[in-house]
C-alpha cells in the first residue's frame, strides 16, 4: 500500500531570463527512493539515481543544474519554459510517486497587476 505523499514548491511565476528552483519532497513513507526523474510534458530533463548520481539530458545541459538536494534549478528562463513539470519518485517497495509543478515564465514587461516575480 502506498502511504507516501509528495509536497512540492507549489506553482511558480517567474521572469524571463531569471532562474527558479523546482523541489519535491516525499514524506509519510519508509520506502527507499531509488531514483527521481524530472520531466516536462514528455521530455526527460534530468535523473538523480541513488547509486549513479545525476544525469542531465544533453539538450538541457546549458540551462539545468542539479539540486539543491533532489530538486532542479532552471536557469536563463524563456517563455517557452512555461508548462508543467513532474518529479517522479521511483521507490521500493511502494512504486512510483509523482508531484506536479506549473511554471509560468513572463516577459519582463508583462508584470501585470503588480505581479511579484521570483528570481532567487
Amino acid at each position: 500500500m502506498m502511504t507516501g505523499t509528495i509536497e512540492t514548491t507549489g506553482n511558480i511565476s517567474a521572469e524571463k531570463g531569471g532562474s527558479i528552483i523546482l523541489q519535491c519532497h516525499l514524506s509519510s513513507t519508509t520506502a527507499q527512493v531509488t531514483q527521481v526523474n524530472w520531466e516536462q510534458q514528455d521530455q526527460l530533463l534530468a535523473i538523480c539515481n541513488a547509486d549513479l548520481g545525476w544525469h542531465i539530458s544533453p539538450s538541457f545541459k546549458d540551462r539545468v543544474a542539479p539540486g539543491p538536494g533532489l530538486g532542479l534549478t532552471l536557469q536563463s528562463l524563456t517563455v517557452n519554459d512555461t508548462g508543467e513539470y513532474f518529479c517522479i519518485y521511483h521507490t521500493y517497495p511502494d512504486g512510483t510517486y509523482t508531484g506536479r509543478i506549473f511554471l509560468e515564465v513572463l516577459e519582463s514587461s508583462v508584470a501585470e497587476h503588480g505581479a511579484r516575480f521570483q528570481i532567487p
Epitope: N11, E104, A115
Partner: antibody, heavy 119, light 112 residues
Framework: EVQLQQSGPELVKPGASMKISCKAS????????MNWVKQSHGKNLEWIGL????????SYNQNFRGKATLTVDKSSSTAYMELLSLTSEDSAVYYC????????????WGQGTSVTVSS | DVVVTQTPLSLPVSFGDQVSISCRSS???????????LSWYLHKPGQSPQLLIY???NRFSGVPDRFSGSGSGTDFTLKISTVKPEDLGMYYC?????????FGGGTKLEIK
C-alpha cells in the same frame, strides 16, 4: 474588449464524443493560457485543465485525463475542448476562461456551453 | 489534491450589511517563494463567473472597493463592506498554488 465566445448548447447520446469551441478576441491569443471549467448541478466548479497556445503545452486535472482533450487553432484564435465517451455524469455547463498572467487564476470567462447527455 | 472548504454554505443578508466569507485549504497556499495564489469569484444566475480578487487581496479591474480579500497560509476571507443588490449570487474561492487548481464549494449570498 476581451471576449470569449463559446459554441451553443449540445444534446448528445451516451458513448458519443463532442467538441466545444471558444473563440477569443480583443487580446493577443498566444500570450495567455486558456483554461476550462466544469459546472455540475448548477453548483460545483471543477478546473479541467489549461492549454498554453504559445508552446502547445497542457496541464490537466487528473480527474479529466482521458475524458477531455484540449487543443487550439492559433490562426483563428480559437480554443477547443473535446469530451470523449460521454456519460450522464458529463452533463454540465462548460466554461473557457483566460488565464490571468502571473497569478494562476482566470480573468475573463466565456458564456458557457450546456452539454446534456441523454439517450 | 488540495481540498478547499468554504463557509458558510448560505449567507442570508439585508442590503447594507457587512459580511465575510471564509475559505480554508487543506495545505498552505504559499509557494516556496512566498507567493499565494488564492482568488475569489462571483457567479450570478444566468451569467459567467466574474473575477473579484486575485493573489489574496488584489481587486480586479472594475471591482468596487467594498470587496476586499485577506488571509495567509490556509485561511482566507472575502469581505463585502456594504452589500448591494447586485452582489447576490454564488461566491467561490479558487486555489492556484497546487496542481490541480481547486475551487471551494461555494457560498450563496441571498436576501433574508
Amino acid at each position: 474588449e476581451v471576449q470569449l465566445q463559446q459554441s451553443g448548447p449540445e444534446l448528445v447520446k451516451p458513448g458519443a464524443s463532442m467538441k466545444i469551441s471558444c473563440k477569443a478576441s480583443g487580446y493577443s491569443f498566444t500570450g495567455y493560457t486558456m483554461n476550462w471549467v466544469k459546472q455540475s448541478h448548477g453548483k460545483n466548479l471543477e478546473w479541467i485543465g489549461l492549454f498554453i497556445p504559445y508552446n502547445g503545452g497542457t496541464s490537466y486535472n487528473q480527474n479529466f485525463r482521458g475524458k477531455a482533450t484540449l487543443t487550439v487553432d492559433k490562426s483563428s484564435s480559437t480554443a477547443y475542448m473535446e469530451l470523449l465517451s460521454l456519460t450522464s455524469e458529463d452533463s454540465a455547463v462548460y466554461y473557457c476562461a483566460r488565464g490571468l498572467r502571473g497569478f494562476f487564476s482566470m480573468d475573463y470567462w466565456g458564456q458557457g456551453t450546456s452539454v446534456t447527455v441523454s439517450s | 489534491d488540495v481540498v478547499v472548504t468554504q463557509t458558510p454554505l448560505s449567507l442570508p443578508v439585508s442590503f447594507g450589511d457587512q459580511v465575510s466569507i471564509s475559505c480554508r485549504s487543506s495545505q498552505s497556499l504559499a509557494n516556496s517563494y512566498g507567493n499565494t495564489y488564492l482568488s475569489w469569484y462571483l457567479h450570478k444566475p444566468g451569467q459567467s463567473p466574474q473575477l473579484l480578487i486575485y493573489g489574496i487581496s488584489n481587486r480586479f479591474s472594475g471591482v468596487p472597493d467594498r470587496f476586499s480579500g485577506s488571509g495567509s497560509g490556509t485561511d482566507f476571507t472575502l469581505k463585502i463592506s456594504t452589500v448591494k443588490p447586485e452582489d447576490l449570487g454564488m461566491y467561490y474561492c479558487l486555489q492556484g498554488t497546487h496542481q490541480p487548481w481547486t475551487f471551494g464549494g461555494g457560498t450563496k449570498l441571498e436576501i433574508k
